[in-house]
Amino acid sequence: CKAMHVAQPAVVLASSRGIASFVCEYASPGKATEVRVTVLRQADSQVTEVCAATYMMGNELTFLDDSICTGTSSGNQVNLTIQGLRAMDTGLYICKVELMYPPPYYLGIGNGTQIYVIDPEPCPDSDF
């Protein structure tokens, strides 16, 4: 028996508007009805929780109102979008998936997605 497998892309480049999207896919060993997805950021030996959501299979993924994350789920796949990113937010973003119900509980952690964020150059002043 091994840990539940979680797959995510190795690298994602955020858009010029500071938005990054990636898919987190997990190989469910059972038929979970309640799943918790957490996005963690590891950078400079620090680990922080970016956002988390618990959802019922077949229902919408709901993050807190003030969360920088949004997402949708389809089967064992979660499509995650992180907004408001700046260059200082560059780091390894790890998808953590927990199958909460019914028992048994399972935990899976992806190998992380390196998100690169480049702050846009300010627009030059125009004479017009």
């Epitope: 028996c1 840990a3 590891q42 030996s45 620090q46 922080t48 935990l107 190998n111 992380g112």
Partner: nanobody, 127 residues
Framework: EVQLVESGGGLVQPGGSLRLSCAAS????????IGWFRQAPGKERETVSC??????SYADSVKGRFTISRDNSKNTLYLQMNSLRAEDTAVYYC??????????????????????WTQGTQVTVSS
């Protein structure tokens, strides 16, 4: 799936010793980092120590006093606690995390990466 059961808590005098055990069933411990954590009343859960196949890590507050070890043949994790102090009083938890290539000495014990939490065992250091 992994199931963890801990034992070994209790009341001990300052300067005394205790050994906590965490037995795993349903899986070998080999692909996991196993950690000890503790939570004192009114405080956040904090890392005590963790161990994987090749590395151990300790919180600064317990270095030199606590020793973590694992016996893969018994599928059991141990925490030997010596020179106990009043500030070590807390509920102690065992938890597991899949061992990942990006874990560093500084992050492999981070509680965010863990699951399979035990119910906790009370350790009280008092005279």
């Amino acid at each position: 799936e992994v199931q963890l059961v801990e034992s070994g808590g209790g009341l001990v005098q300052p300067g005394g010793s205790l050994r906590l055990s965490c037995a795993a069933s349903g899986s070998t411990l080999d692909p996991f980092v196993i950690g000890w954590f503790r939570q004192a009343p009114g405080k956040e859960r904090e890392t005590v120590s963790c161990i994987n196949r090749s590395r151990t890590s300790y919180a600064d507050s317990v270095k030199g006093r606590f020793t973590i070890s694992r016996d893969n043949s018994k599928n059991t994790l141990y925490l030997q606690m010596n020179s106990l102090r009043a500030e070590d009083t807390a509920v102690y938890y065992c938890a597991a995390s899949p061992d990942k290539p990006f874990y560093t000495d500084q992050t492999m014990c981070n509680k965010h990466y863990y699951g399979y939490w035990t119910q906790g065992t009370q350790v009280t250091v008092s005279s």
